[in-house]
Amino acid sequence: VPPYGSENQTCRDQEKEYYEPRHRICCSRCPPGTYVSAKCSRSRDTVCATCAENSYNEHWNYLTICQLCRPCDPVMGLEEIAPCTSKRKTQCRCQPGMFCAAWALECTHCELLSDCPPGTEAELKDEVGKGNNHCVPCKAGHFQNTSSPSARCQPHTRCEDQGLVEAAPGTAQSDTTCRNPSESLPPEMSGTMLM
């Protein structure tokens, strides 16, 4: 149990203890949400106090002060997902339609997602906002006809499901064109029934 002497300048629990060179001892760090209000000595361990309002310390530490809670910067494309607490800084993420363009331990700057051209869609990512769009072609039987960062490929219309016949096959960029079986010329319609 700290404090205890250490000749080799290392402590048994690196996460929760630190080496104090003046006394050549290992002392307790303060837990998240607290700071050092009185430093340790040979006879007394570190005394910790809770971070004041609007401040935090995230890790086991031997800081004599807490960090200022800061907002997510909207100009950098960030939005808040969880407020600051004594144990955790404000949690931020990229605003919808944006991705993280600069990373320094955490995201510091988001940019607009690139458009995916017609015939493609953005590959689904595990985590929203982590990277720019990677556009992949629509799979067979699907189409996407806009330039958009978020549009998804849709299945081609099945003319027979609507009692129609195919006038023009669908492509990656356009839907199937259907016509009434009794009509000789196909109308300029995409996947809709002519009444």
Epitope: Y62, L63, I65, R70, V75, P83
Partner: antibody
Framework: QVQLVQSGAEVKKPGSSVKVSCKAS????????ISWVRQAPGQGLEWMGG????????NYAQKFQGRVTITADKSTSTAYMELSSLRSEDTAVYYC?????????????WGQGTTVTVSS | DIVMTQSPDSLAVSLGERATINCKSS????????????LAWYQQKPGQPPKLLIY???TRESGVPDRFSGSGSGTDFTLTISSLQAEDVAVYYC?????????FGQGTKVEIK
């Protein structure tokens, strides 16, 4: 009482580098972010960057990125600001400053300033 | 970065009169979660480093005379010297600490008329 004492005035040639020191006393050096702020003659205040000594991580203003290096020596409670590729526009008073209420809050304590003159 | 713009650039006021300095930020410096404005005011006299006067937009630093007061919220802030004294002749700066990339206004020079 916290005191920040800076190194003396420097005269430098264009293209060279300058390294200004800031020694802290009367407080826990490593727990507070040290900022560097400069002021050209007759001009306003301009934040250059800062460092949290206990973390060792520095943070720079876009304008100075790649030209300024801020470091800290915990053993001597001293912070350093090195500015390279000096030009005449870098002639200014350079201040170090630190907060007191929070690790990285508003700037309460300021050094006396170091005059750097860049001239051929 | 957040741009801070002060007005006027200079101000001449008679002794005992009120001096008002305005500061506008390019984006809000109000954090809605704690309802605090991340704005400070500094005073700088010739040949001296800046001195903190006000933080959280309106909280006076200890030892600062009560003739100095700060007000405002969001993007618009004001520093008021209710009764100008000779020792108040200086340049005044507003500064945001909403981001860790601190920025300052261009300064307002206060002189005696």
């Amino acid at each position: 009482q916290v005191q920040l004492v800076q190194s003396g005035a420097e005269v430098k040639k264009p293209g060279s580098s300058v390294k200004v020191s800031c020694k802290a006393s009367g407080g826990t050096f490593s727990s507070y972010a040290i900022s560097w702020v400069r002021q050209a003659p007759g001009q306003g205040l301009e934040w250059m960057g800062g460092i949290i000594p206990i973390h060792g991580t520095a943070n720079y203003a876009q304008k100075f990125q790649g030209r300024v290096t801020i470091t800290a020596d915990k053993s001597t409670s001293t912070a350093y600001m090195e500015l390279s590729s000096l030009r005449s526009e870098d002639t200014a008073v350079y201040y170090c400053a630190r907060p007191s209420y929070y690790l990285d809050g508003w700037l309460d304590y300021w050094g006396q300033g170091t005059t750097v003159t860049v001239s051929s | 970065d957040i741009v801070m713009t002060q007005s006027p650039d200079s101000l001449a006021v008679s002794l005992g009169e009120r001096a008002t300095i305005n500061c506008k930020s390019s984006q809000s410096v109000l954090y809605s979660s704690n309802n605090k404005n991340y704005l400070a005011w500094y005073q700088q006299k010739p040949g001296q480093p800046p001195k903190l006067l006000i933080y959280w937009a309106s909280t006076r630093e200890s030892g600062v005379p009560d003739r100095f007061s700060g007000s405002g919220s969001g993007t618009d802030f004001t520093l008021t010297i209710s009764s100008l004294q000779a020792e108040d002749v200086a340049v005044y700066y507003c500064s945001q600490y909403y981001t860790t990339h601190y920025t300052f206004g261009q300064g307002t020079k206060v002189e005696i008329k």
